[in-house]
Interface confidence: low
């Protein structure tokens, strides 16, 4: 198809050679087509434009992306030729940085339903280059953590070395949606919730005497809890004595709750005390029975094939430990009467 009628946008991706980072292109179809086509969920029924040139399907992935080879060859379908580029709805994700991503990318609707649609396309000229500015050694990461329940901020990596005063106006997107109120190089979050997690994109415009282009960076934001300050607690067994029947098999379960730690090396084991002797028991593997953002519950059982008289004189001790400290719970077996 003829791409001479496509609207054109120039973008710059300056990537850090020290870190892994991703990049995205949005299919910025001209209004009102874009509203109808890619971001329909932003419109209430009353806001639907009267004239919609694109009458394609409601499928949000209904755009086609191409790359224009620099040698003038025909346009190439992105999905067939570029495994490191993934299309998600109206967004093109570049999974790996590198100057070989430089080039012209064209998006347009898959379904051409009217003469208007032919000229409905966007050509994005992407320039990719490694970061050379050594003066900004501590630029913000493309992976940023927000601590749940606290105040935090998300910084635009390409602008993080500039003060707020000298920073240009920034356009922010979260998971492909425009954050219209954010215009600074830093988003301040008063209280962090899990919904703040996602893929953020920050854009600003740079110009010279000849032309202007958009500088874009992508930030993956995760919400995390702080490392626990508590040693693990044993949820089961609660009682320190257990009634048993002699000669019968017995399973005693130890369940412990471990708070979140980034470096997580939980220990849960059983050992037996018999007068002055103490030894660790070889028991089945521990298993995680519940895992949440804040903590993990791990269980480990001790199995006695047959309870003997000798077992009644022993103490069975569950020992749990994390980087903060350890906790134990001992159980004495008592013969069931009657």
């Amino acid at each position: 198809f003829n791409i001479s009628g496509c609207s054109t946008k120039k973008l710059l991706w300056t990537y850090s050679t020290r870190s892994e980072e991703e990049f995205v292109l949005f299919c910025d179809l001209p209004e009102p087509q874009k509203s109808h086509f890619c971001h329909r969920n932003r419109l209430s029924p009353k806001q639907v434009p009267e004239h919609l040139p694109f009458m394609g399907s409601n499928d949000l992935s209904d755009v086609q992306w191409y790359q224009q080879p620099s040698n003038g060859d025909p346009l190439e379908d992105i999905r067939k030729s570029y495994p490191h580029i993934i299309q998600d709805k109206c967004t093109l994700h570049f999974l790996t940085p590198g100057v070989n991503n430089s080039g012209s990318y064209i998006c347009r609707p898959k379904m051409i339903k009217s003469p208007y649609d032919v000229a409905c396309c966007v050509k994005m000229i992407l320039e990719v280059k490694p970061q050379t500015n050594a003066s900004c050694e501590y630029s913000a990461s493309h992976k940023q953590d927000l601590l749940l329940g606290s105040t935090g901020s998300i910084s635009c990596p390409s602008l993080s070395c500039q003060s707020d005063a000298q920073s240009p106006a920034v356009t922010w997107y979260k998971n492909g949606k425009l954050l219209s109120v954010e215009r600074s190089n830093r988003i301040v979050v008063d209280e962090v919730y899990d919904y703040h997690q996602g893929t953020y994109v920050c854009d600003y415009t740079q110009s010279d005497t000849v032309s202007s282009w958009t500088v874009r960076a992508v930030v993956q934001v995760r919400t995390i809890v702080g490392d626990t300050k508590l040693k693990p607690d044993i949820l089961d067994p609660v009682e320190d004595t257990l009634e048993v029947e002699l000669g019968k098999p017995l399973t005693i379960s130890c369940k412990a709750r471990f708070g979140f730690e980034r470096v997580f090396n939980p220990v849960i084991k059983w050992y037996i005390k018999d007068s002055d002797l103490e030894w660790e028991v070889s028991v089945p593997e521990a298993k995680s029975i519940k895992s949440t953002l804040k903590d993990e519950i791990i269980e480990r059982n001790i199995i006695l094939e047959k309870v003997t008289q000798r077992d009644l004189r022993r103490k069975f001790v569950c020992f749990v430990q994390n980087s903060i400290g350890n906790t134990t719970q001992s159980v004495q077996l008592k013969e069931k009467r009657g």
């Epitope: 050679t17 020290r18 870190s19 892994e20 991703e22 495994p83 490191h84 999974l95 790996t96 990461s141 992976k143 953590d145 993956q220 995760r222 980034r262």
Partner: nanobody, 124 residues
Framework: DVQLQESGGGLVQAGGSLRLSCAAS????????MGWFRQAPGMVREFVAA????????YYADSVQGRFTISRDNAKNTVYLQMNSLKPEDTAVYYC?????????????????WGQGTQVTVSS
Amino acid sequence: DVQLQESGGGLVQAGGSLRLSCAASGRTFSSYAMGWFRQAPGMVREFVAAISWSGGSTYYADSVQGRFTISRDNAKNTVYLQMNSLKPEDTAVYYCAADRSLSGSYFGATIDYWGQGTQVTVSS
């Protein structure tokens, strides 16, 4: 989808060496950061080492730093873990993993694909 198949595990004496391999099927292998985790009896799965999509960045758990080396060959769709100066506490099932995002603290938070695991036993 990416399928991962580990090999190279076995029984070795303390102080010895082993080289684990993880063969990946799928065209997009080179887009993924790759890593190794291990699970010893009675413990939960723990991070061992990871390597970025390009091989330019590597990350190691403190317990294996200086003894283990992770590498990858994108042409062969394979990631390797060279384990030297093995200790009895390295005994575990070793799992290969693939993830689209990688920085040291994230790898393992949301793993896209896991292998089935290979047993490594270090005797004293």
